[in-house]
């Protein structure tokens, strides 16, 4: 299940991954030394019955339909890290791999 | 981040894990030999700003606020498998670990 990839010109209404560049400079997040911006992507779209479901559980909860369950939503199902150079709260420069920064795939869960 | 656990008597409105027993017999899924029912749990509740966010990405997308991004939703952030005995489509009996069957934790992503 590779998920769908869309862009701003797509007419796709279902759950899809869209391009998004996060710009730390524009946020004023100057404790991040590098990168100043990166391709993060995001998920958006509708989760129709059985479409792009990551887990069997998603379908089962739809079947069981408990009170308060809102149905699946379009959310990252595969994420990846990026390397970042930044100041920690002690003003030390840290170089490290930060998980959960890039959406590689979207799905319904 | 362990997530919240609730039950049907809870007054919690935020993203929370609720108990749910899935009953295969009740669904009429007779190809599943065992278990006939299991504790699956489900996620429900509101995702307020910065609450229970699994990934840094979730916060960054809220900051960047792209067109069409719906905001984070309450979804499983940790799942586990169960062992199942079932008939496959060739009517062979299979015993195996089926991933993504139990919600261990809920969060906003």
């Amino acid at each position: 299940n590779l998920g769908l990839d869309c862009d701003e010109h797509s007419s796709e209404s279902r759950c899809c991954r869209y391009p998004l560049t996060v710009d730390f400079e524009a946020f004023g997040w100057d404790w991040i030394i590098a990168p100043k911006r990166y391709k993060a992507n995001y998920c958006s779209g509708q989760c129709e019955y059985m479409f792009m479901q990551k887990y069997p559980h998603t379908h089962l909860v739809q079947q069981a339909n408990p009170r308060g369950s809102a149905g699946p939503c379009c959310t990252p199902t595969k994420m990846s890290p990026i390397n970042m150079l930044y100041f920690n709260d002690k003003q030390q420069i840290i170089y490290g791999k930060i998980p959960g920064m890039v959406v590689d795939r979207c799905g319904c869960s | 981040n362990l997530g919240l656990d609730c039950d049907e008597h809870s007054s919690e409105s935020r993203c929370c894990r609720y108990p749910l027993t899935v009953d295969f017999e009740a669904f009429g899924w007779d190809w599943i030999i065992a278990p006939k029912r299991y504790k699956a749990n489900y996620c429900s509740g509101q995702c307020e700003y910065m609450f229970m966010q699994k990934y840094p990405h979730t916060h960054l997308v809220q900051q960047a606020n792209p067109r069409g991004s719906a905001g984070p939703c309450c979804t499983p952030t940790k799942m586990s498998p169960i062992n199942m005995l079932y008939f496959n489509d060739k009517q062979q009996i299979i015993y195996g670990k089926i991933p993504g069957m139990v919600v261990d934790r809920c969060g906003c992503s």
Partner: antibody
Framework: QVQLVQSGAEVKKPGASVKVSCKAS????????MHWVRQAPGQGLEWIGN????????NYNQRFKARATLTVDKSTSTAYMELRSLRSDDTAVYYC?????????????????WGQGTLVTVSS | DIQMTQSPSSLSASVGDRVTITCKAS??????LSWFQQKPGKAPKTLIY???RLVDGVPSKFSGSGSGTDYTLTISSLQPEDFATYYC?????????FGQGTKLEIK
């Protein structure tokens, strides 16, 4: 466009201090390291130190640590290099330069923009 | 401190020539080496970074190579505007150190 404009030439007596300014424009001043480099007449380039304007974290060449102070004024996007107890061999052109990261590793950078230089003459 | 030894200190060449300038570090600098061009009365200009990457807008006649302790700047076909002084810089560790420069003169 990104620009660094330095203050004008200075003539100082031995033992005095000098403060050279470097005004940045065309980018987010607080988010990029500023470096200072000097060049004595007819000589090579010598690194003095750097400063990160966001939090004023700085590094110095040990040769200058006792006499040089790097500061910033975020409100005016200006970096300063002050050198105290001047000697005749401090006569040099002083440059500021912006450090630009092309990657994320600690050394993944180069100088993409330089100031025009400030000549400091130390003479009795 | 890491010592950067640049050679030759001066070089005479003609328009159209191919020239090579070398820089030797006193220890491995992991390819964290930049090359600069400086003209009289002007600030230095970065040509090459990370040993072999060309800065945007710099002509491709400039190229860099090397690893470990030994690095080279090559100018493939000299033009009148290339006569200047060239410096190397190691940025692998503090303090940053420059080579002493190579003055490229017209023959």
């Amino acid at each position: 466009q990104v620009q660094l404009v330095q203050s004008g030439a200075e003539v100082k007596k031995p033992g005095a201090s000098v403060k050279v300014s470097c005004k940045a424009s065309g980018y987010s001043f607080t988010g990029y390291f500023m470096h200072w480099v000097r060049q004595a007449p007819g000589q090579g380039l010598e690194w003095i130190g750097n400063i990160y304007p966001y939090n004023s974290v700085s590094n110095y060449n040990q040769r200058f640590k006792a006499r040089a102070t790097l500061t910033v004024d975020k409100s005016t996007s200006t970096a300063y290099m002050e050198l105290r107890s001047l000697r005749s061999d401090d006569t040099a052109v002083y440059y500021c330069a912006r450090r630009y990261y092309y990657g994320t590793g600690p050394a993944d950078w180069y100088y993409d923009v330089w100031g025009q230089g400030t000549l400091v003459t130390v003479s009795s | 401190d890491i010592q950067m030894t640049q050679s030759p200190s001066s070089l005479s060449a003609s328009v159209g020539d191919r020239v090579t300038i070398t820089c030797k570090a006193s220890q491995d600098i992991n390819s964290y080496l930049s090359w600069f061009q400086q003209k009289p009365g002007k600030a230095p200009k970065t040509l090459i970074y990370r040993a072999n990457r060309l800065v945007d807008g710099v002509p491709s006649k400039f190229s860099g190579s090397g690893s470990g302790t030994d690095y080279t700047l090559t100018i493939s076909s000299l033009q009148p505007e290339d006569f200047a002084t060239y410096y190397c810089l190691q940025s692998d560790e503090f303090p940053l150190t420059f080579g002493q420069g190579t003055k490229l003169e017209i023959k």
